[in-house]
């Protein structure tokens, strides 16, 4: 007898975009309409929740904008939390200081990208400093990932 | 009888690298000398080809300079062109202003990567509003993807 | 008989986190303790040795920051080293001029990431123009890469 | 045709301020700064400072610092410079110069415009 | 600041002759593989006219008599053969780093 068709396994992915009605910390995505992926993965406040073990690429893109600069220190961190551990682990972080001409309009990206080994329950989140310098245009802020 | 050999499938991988010969947008890119990748895409005219359905990481960095800052607005996308989509789709974008003092000699890159869920036939360009300060050389300014 | 068992092969990986006693070039990397993944590639002096001819992601995140800026070149390279060629080849490269406000406290990451093809006994180091203003935290300078 | 034209010849008094203007044409006058340079008579260039035309923030020589101040005014492409507390020594030609950020110098100048400190 | 020193201060040189002017700098206005050195022209009542940048390019519309050349910190105008409307003041001027600086100028006259 033949073998049984081979079962082709999901691609564990993400790909979530920025949500402008954001309003504390950690950031909220978009995760069901325009360019979002979201697949073997879940999505719960803000976070992304590991459901299988092993090795991902994470990555973030944070677009900071101000009408009137007065280079106030920005953040953008990705980090993890597992109800095993009593803290945030930060797994990856950018910081911007004096970036821009003082009472300037100005714009500036921060990205963040990784490999990381993740357990199954690992919950994922951004962070951001100036959470009302942030703007939340689908192609410019964003949070994802994928199983290797 | 032994099973036939597994057919070991080419991975559809592309790296591309600034072609200082580009004049208008999109820009063009390098696809034939130095350290450039093309495999089971297509390059055509400024843009990759996807041939197969699927997930796709992909990623960009343009480096910009000038030796006169005078902070013009910089961005940097990457979108993409279906024939069956009346208007292009930006995937990924970066924006810069007020990013160095007036007069100056200065120096910027802007880097982008997601995962994207691209159909046969899409193709993928990258755009940036100041063709006159980017700088091609390979290792600075480049394009790429891989199927996940 | 039913056949033998898949052997489910190791996937090559690495992230590799900023070491503070870095003294020179190329910066060495912390490859034991914390985030740290290091899996079918070796770490020898500073460098990430590769052991299997393929295409791989390799990317890099450097932090710089200081207390006064005077806006010194920043550069951050991903080169290769190979003994059957004499040169290193500069896979990527980011650079910073004019970032900052003189004598402000300031700080900004370099980004790079891209697919190479890349030969075993391949050297991949990790280069930068100011060691002195390199911050090497864990979650801000790192180097990895994963085989496709 | 790329021009800068700027405005005539002026006499003031020590202590007094000049205002010299420098009007762009024949180009996108937003994309390239403008930089004033001086020479006094019989002697060489001495480099005053630069202006943004898209942002409009300036750069100054740290010689001049405090008593010059450039301006733009984006609707008719015209650059401003003004020097205060004029004194016997700031008797020059002052030039403005348009440079284009993805070159290496400055390309056009303007005529130039005499001003003279005199009691 | 980067000090700029032209010599000589005036070079008397014959119409078809080769004139060669110096110019050097206080410290290196290089940086990336490019020289940060620009040549002027300038006649009696006139603005400056540029002639070379990036130390060896010649600027568009000049003749090509006109050369230069050097790298770091000197570097040197060269006018293969004189004509009659060659003779005017030179200058050299870096654009490394604010404050842009120029050199004394050199004269060049008819011999």
């Known amino acids: 007898p033949s073998p049984p068709p081979e079962k082709k396994e999901l691609r564990k992915v993400a790909h979530l975009t920025g949500k402008s009605n954001s309003r504390s910390m950690p950031l909220e995505w978009e995760d069901t309409y325009g360019i979002v992926l979201l697949s073997g993965v879940k999505y719960k406040k803000g976070g992304l929740v590991i459901n299988e073990t092993g090795l991902y690429f994470v990555y973030s893109k944070v677009y900071f904008r101000g009408q009137s600069c007065n280079n106030l220190p920005l953040s953008h961190k990705v980090y993890m939390r597992n109800s095993k551990y009593p803290q945030d682990l930060v797994m990856m972080e950018g910081k911007m200081m004096s970036y821009c001409t003082t009472g300037q309009m100005w714009a500036r990206s921060s990205y963040l990208g990784a490999v990381f080994n993740l357990t199954s329950a690992d919950h994922l989140y951004v962070n951001v400093s100036e959470l009302s310098l942030v703007n939340f245009e689908e192609s410019q802020t964003f949070f994802g990932l994928y199983k290797l | 009888p032994s099973p036939p050999p597994e057919k070991k499938e080419l991975r559809k991988v592309a790296h591309l690298t600034g072609k200082s010969n580009s004049r208008s947008m999109p820009l063009e890119w390098e696809d034939t000398y130095g350290i450039v990748l093309l495999s089971g895409v297509k390059y055509k005219k400024g843009g990759l080809v996807i041939n197969e359905t699927g997930l796709y990481f992909v990623y960009s960095k343009v480096y910009f300079r000038g030796q006169s800052c005078n902070n013009l607005p910089l961005s940097h996308k990457v979108y993409m062109r279906n024939s069956k989509y009346p208007q292009d789709l930006v995937m990924m974008e970066g924006k810069m202003m007020s990013y160095c003092t007036t007069g100056q000699m200065w120096a910027r890159s802007s880097y982008l990567g997601a995962v994207f869920n691209l159909t046969s036939a899409d193709h993928l360009y990258v755009n940036v509003s100041e063709l006159s300060l980017v700088n091609f050389e390979e290792s600075q300014t480049f394009f790429g993807l891989y199927k996940l | 008989p039913s056949p033998p068992p898949e052997k489910k092969e190791l996937r090559k990986v690495a992230h590799l986190t900023g070491k503070s006693n870095s003294r020179s070039m190329p910066l060495e990397w912390e490859d034991t303790y914390g985030i740290v993944l290091l899996s079918g590639v070796k770490y020898k002096k500073g460098g990430l040795v590769i052991n299997e001819t393929g295409l791989y992601f390799v990317y890099s995140k450097v932090y710089f920051r200081g207390q006064s800026c005077n806006n010194l070149p920043l550069s951050h390279k991903v080169y290769m080293r190979n003994s059957k060629y004499p040169q290193d080849l500069v896979m990527m490269e980011g650079k910073m001029m004019s970032y900052c406000t003189t004598g402000q406290m300031w700080a900004r990451s370099s980004y790079l990431g891209a697919v190479f093809n890349l030969t075993s006994a391949d050297h991949l180091y990790v280069n930068v123009s100011e060691l002195s203003l390199v911050n090497f935290e864990e979650s801000q300078t790192f180097f990895g890469l994963y085989k496709l | 045709q790329v021009q800068l034209v700027q405005s005539g010849a002026e006499v003031k008094k020590p202590g007094a301020s000049v205002k010299v203007s420098c009007k762009g044409s024949g180009y996108t006058f937003t994309d390239y700064t403008i930089h004033w340079v001086r020479q006094a008579p019989g002697q060489g260039l001495e480099w005053m400072g630069v202006?943004?035309?898209?942002?409009?923030?300036?750069s100054y020589n740290q010689k001049f610092k405090g008593r010059v101040t450039m301006t733009v005014d984006k609707s008719t492409s015209t650059v401003y410079m003004e020097l205060s507390s004029l004194r016997s020594e700031d008797t020059a030609v002052y030039y403005c110069a348009r440079f284009p950020d993805w070159d290496y110098a400055m390309d056009y100048w303007g005529q130039g415009t005499l001003v003279t400190v005199s009691s | 600041e980067i000090v700029m020193t032209q010599s000589p201060a005036t070079l008397s040189v014959s119409p078809g002759e080769r004139a060669t002017l110096s110019c050097k700098a206080s410290q290196s206005v290089d940086y990336d593989g490019d020289s940060y050195m620009n040549w002027y022209q300038q006649k009696p009542g006139q603005p400056p006219r540029l002639l070379i940048y990036?130390?060896?390019n010649l600027e568009s519309g000049i003749p090509a008599r006109f050369s230069g050349s050097g790298s770091g910190t000197e570097f040197t105008l060269t006018i293969s053969s004189l004509q009659s409307e060659d003779f005017a003041v030179y200058y050299c001027q870096q654009s490394r780093e604010l404050p842009y600086t120029f050199g004394q100028g050199t004269k060049l006259e008819i011999k």
């Open positions: 202006i943004s035309t898209y942002q409009g923030d300036a």
């Open positions: 990036a130390a060896s």
